[in-house]
């Protein structure tokens, strides 16, 4: 029975050129955090392994670095940054959960952060 | 190159506490990645017991999870299964393997090297 | 828990020829799926992680292609040796499952 929840930023907005911090957070479980993936679409960012570390991907690793907590910072955004970003949790012995952010990159500096919100 | 070696008891009898070692040379146990058993029952599929991190944490099969243990000993640059109340079911060869050796090129977790098997019969 | 289910069970191909083997996960995995090749009386050797990686040493009529929860193994032209049985696994979800596997035999 999974019951645990995703809280993650929700809808972000970032300037570019800048970075922007992608976070999520797994409760109201108690399913141990075995790993967690970092996702743009169907690319791989990066990976949090509990017992093997970080590893980021090689076409990320100028613009990813890991951190802080499971969270992921991105730098140097672009406009093409601007899209959906998942964070995929999988736990021990629950399973996999998902939590959804989309970050829109904006050329002005009118960039403001959105509500937290939670997907079960 | 790492290789593994299983051995122990190539029979065993009901009730009692089947006990396997993999034996790893070429790495050290306790410079990461996990250290696994699978088995395979004779003319049958891969069945995953369990994995285990040098620093202790534990993932075992919940259809085996009461009655696994395994354990590593870095001194010996070993680990080890142990599967007790065995019965006719768990007749099978036993395989080591060494997961996640691609983990930090690749970020992709699979059973990179594997030893050789032991079969380990279970009957009275 | 992940149920991968590989078909055909037995798949009759001869020599040169391409084969086309499949797997599918119960729920996505992404693109962290492995591929395992056993020959009788022998280990099960990696061919591929990460869906399309070769693994060391794997020769290049080996290609796996999917994502999500539908993948393919491809055997491009049979050689002798080639003719196993293949397993795909799922990974990083514990506990980590495999597929009943497919015997690629000789027609």
């Known amino acids: 029975m999974m019951t645990g929840t995703i809280e993650t930023t929700g809808n972000i907005s970032a300037e570019k050129g800048g970075s922007i911090i992608l976070q999520c957070h797994l409760s109201s479980t108690t399913a141990q955090v075995t790993q967690v993936n970092w996702e743009q679409q169907d690319q791989l960012l990066a990976i949090c392994n509990a017992d093997l570390g970080w590893h980021i991907s090689p076409s990320f690793k100028d613009r990813v670095a890991p951190g802080p907590g499971l969270g992921l910072t991105l730098q140097s955004l672009t406009v093409n940054d601007t899209g959906e970003y998942f964070c995929i949790y999988h736990t021990y012995p629950d399973g996999t959960y998902t939590g959804r952010i989309f970050l829109e990159v904006l050329e002005s500096s009118v960039a403001e952060h959105g509500a937290r919100f939670q997907i079960p | 190159q790492v290789q593994l070696q299983e051995s122990g008891p190539g029979l065993v009898k009901p009730s009692e506490t089947l006990s396997l070692t993999c034996a790893v040379s070429g790495y050290s146990i306790s410079s990461g990645y996990y250290w696994a058993w699978i088995r395979q029952p004779p003319g049958k599929g891969l069945e995953w017991i369990g994995s285990i991190y040098h620093s202790g944490s534990t993932y075992y099969n919940p259809s085996l999870k009461s009655r696994v243990t395994i354990s590593v000993d870095t001194s010996k640059n070993q680990f080890s299964l142990k599967l007790s109340s065995v019965t006719a079911a768990d007749t099978a060869v036993y395989y080591c393997?060494?997961?996640?050796?691609?983990?930090?090129?690749?970020?992709?977790?699979?059973?990179?090297?594997w030893g050789q098997g032991t079969m380990v019969t279970v009957s009275s | 828990e992940i149920v991968m289910t590989q078909s055909p069970a037995t798949l009759s191909v001869s020599p040169g020829e391409r084969a086309t083997l499949s797997c599918r996960a119960s729920?996505?995995?992404?693109?962290?799926l492995a591929w395992y090749q056993q020959k009788p009386g022998q280990a099960p050797r990696l061919l591929i992680y990460g869906a399309s990686t070769r693994a060391t040493g794997i020769p290049a009529r080996f290609s796996g292609s999917g994502s999500g929860t539908e993948f393919t193994l491809t055997i491009s032209s049979l050689q002798s040796e080639d003719f196993a049985v293949y397993y795909c696994?799922?990974?990083?979800?514990?506990?980590?499952?495999f597929g009943g596997g497919t015997k690629v035999e000789i027609k």
């Open positions: 729920q996505s995995v992404s693109s962290n």
């Open positions: 393997a060494i997961e996640g050796a691609n983990y930090y090129d690749f970020g992709y977790v699979a059973f990179d090297i």
């Open positions: 696994q799922q990974s990083p979800p514990w506990p980590r499952t």
